[in-house]
């Protein structure tokens, strides 16, 4: 009769992830290993799994040398993959005979797989005492919450280790625009995005650019997670009296100024730098449906 060297272990995994179950059996002759599955619903029946099942999300790798070893992997997990996975082993030569009854029972080892789905998050944006408060509330969680994280534009704004099903964040009134993310920890528990409207948030590549006479300078302004998206970029050069002279694309092919803009970025290229004309403070102006924001870049030109 066959016996198990290694039985599959019960596991919890997040939806979208994968699970791997491992089973090893000994016997003489070397036993065959099969994988079976039974769902958690009352009327779910037991069905055999094969390599390529469930739209090629199920893969089975087996090795039969001194003993039998088999690994079952399920990718792209969904709630329907929750259930009991059974490793069956038999050394009976007649185990698969269509008419002759098996002489020895299949031995079985079971593992429970629970596919955890992120909870549903309700979000709200409220004005409280002239401050903007963002709230995320999780309906339920299959695992213990160990904290919360708030992010914007890839930066962590706030983090805690509270076990609550809700979390709040107060937005900086002068710097509100952008897509905020609330994350319930451990990370797959739940995540939601909240778009907060406001004037553009922009940053410059470098506060100060240095170039030499005759060369070119590239001045760059970038959107920093602005919402709504930036629709217009303008460039100015300020005189010593603060007068702002608009800079537009030169019409001639080898023109002095070239401005290339996307909602995410604007670049002003100044060619053939003149030490008497081009040094100074340049202003990039970004506009969206909520307003206008500007940033400055200082250009210094060294004479040859």
């Amino acid at each position: 009769a066959a016996g198990f060297l290694k039985a599959p272990l019960s596991q919890e995994r997040w939806a979208g992830g994968s699970v791997v179950l491992h089973c090893e059996a000994v016997g003489s002759p070397i036993p065959e290993i099969q994988w079976w599955f039974e769902g958690n619903a009352p009327n779910d029946s037991c069905s055999q799994l094969w390599d390529g099942a469930r739209l090629d999300r199920v893969h089975i790798h087996a090795a039969y040398r001194q003993h039998a070893a088999s690994s079952l992997s399920v990718d792209g997990l969904t709630a329907e993959d929750t259930g009991t996975y059974e490793c069956r082993a038999s050394s009976d030569p007649d185990r698969n005979h269509l008419t002759r009854p098996p002489r020895v029972k299949w031995v079985r080892a079971q593992a429970s797989v629970v596919v955890l789905e992120p909870g549903t998050i309700q979000t709200s944006v409220q004005e409280v005492n002239s401050k903007t408060q963002l709230t995320c509330s999780l309906n339920s969680s299959g695992v213990d919450i160990v904290g919360h994280r708030w992010m914007r534009g890839g930066k962590v704004l706030q983090e805690d280790t509270l076990p609550d099903l809700h979390t709040k964040y107060i937005v900086d009134a002068d710097d509100r625009s952008g897509e905020y993310s609330c994350i319930f920890l451990p990370e797959p528990v739940g995540r939601s995005e909240i778009n907060v409207e406001g004037p553009p948030r922009i940053k410059v590549g470098k506060k100060s650019e240095h170039s030499s006479e005759g060369e070119l300078a590239k001045l760059v302004c970038k959107s920093d997670a602005s919402y709504p998206p930036i629709t217009d970029w303008f460039w100015f050069k300020t005189s010593d009296t603060g007068e702002e002279e608009a800079i537009t694309n030169s019409t001639e092919a080898n023109g002095k100024y070239v401005v290339v803009s996307t909602p995410e970025k604007s670049q002003l290229t100044i060619s053939n730098l003149d030490v008497n004309v081009d040094p100074g403070t340049y202003v990039c102006n970004a506009t969206n449906a909520q307003g206008t924001t500007r940033e400055t870049i200082s250009l210094r030109v060294r004479s040859r």
Epitope: D240, T241, G242, E244, T281, T293, R294, E295, S298
Partner: antibody, heavy 116, light 106 residues
Framework: EVQLVESGGGLVLPGRSMKLSCAAS????????MAWVRQAPTKGLEWVAS????????YYRDSVMGRFTISRDDAKSTLHLQMDNLRSEDTATYYC?????????WGQGVMVTVSS | EIVLTQSPATMPASPGEKVTLTCRAS?????IYWYQQKSGTSPKLWIY???KLASGVPNRFSGSGSGTSYSLTISSMETEDTATYYC?????????FGSGTKLEIK
Amino acid sequence: EVQLVESGGGLVLPGRSMKLSCAASGFTFRTYYMAWVRQAPTKGLEWVASISIGGDNTYYRDSVMGRFTISRDDAKSTLHLQMDNLRSEDTATYYCVRLRGYFDYWGQGVMVTVSS
Amino acid sequence: EIVLTQSPATMPASPGEKVTLTCRASSSIRYIYWYQQKSGTSPKLWIYDTSKLASGVPNRFSGSGSGTSYSLTISSMETEDTATYYCQQGRSYPLTFGSGTKLEIK
């Protein structure tokens, strides 16, 4: 909403000093030139001093050069005007203004009276 | 120093009347700027870049000119337009204002 609020005015003796401050809000202070403009009682407007973005360059009218110092604190969005060796002709309402070649926003003004 | 000369110093006008205030510069400038100041209040930017109306300025106001000669025009005078109007240049230091035109209601 752009706001410029001046403080620090009052009565001062000739030859003494006084410092005016201006708290700015509602715009990205560090990206604008700033200035002070004054108006003597029943007289016209007179530019006093201005300061560049970053504060590297300052400009003054001849009559205050060497006596007045304009400065800015971008971290606090505040503009200052240090006035030393004050004269009776410096008596005026002093306005903090945002400068773009023209003065697009004005504070409410602060009265400085130089008198013995 | 660029000197700005405003004329007239005082101008009485009747409601509905067309009014033109002038500002002459001692040397050529690119733009002129106009401000309105009512008694006891801070000046307000009224017209910038010679002809652009500042936010909230009624469209009965207009500005024009070039070089050394500039003007502010009110197509139809209203009581609320009673104020002193100053022109200013931002071309070079020292920044200078005209001496102002006091616009009064007849």
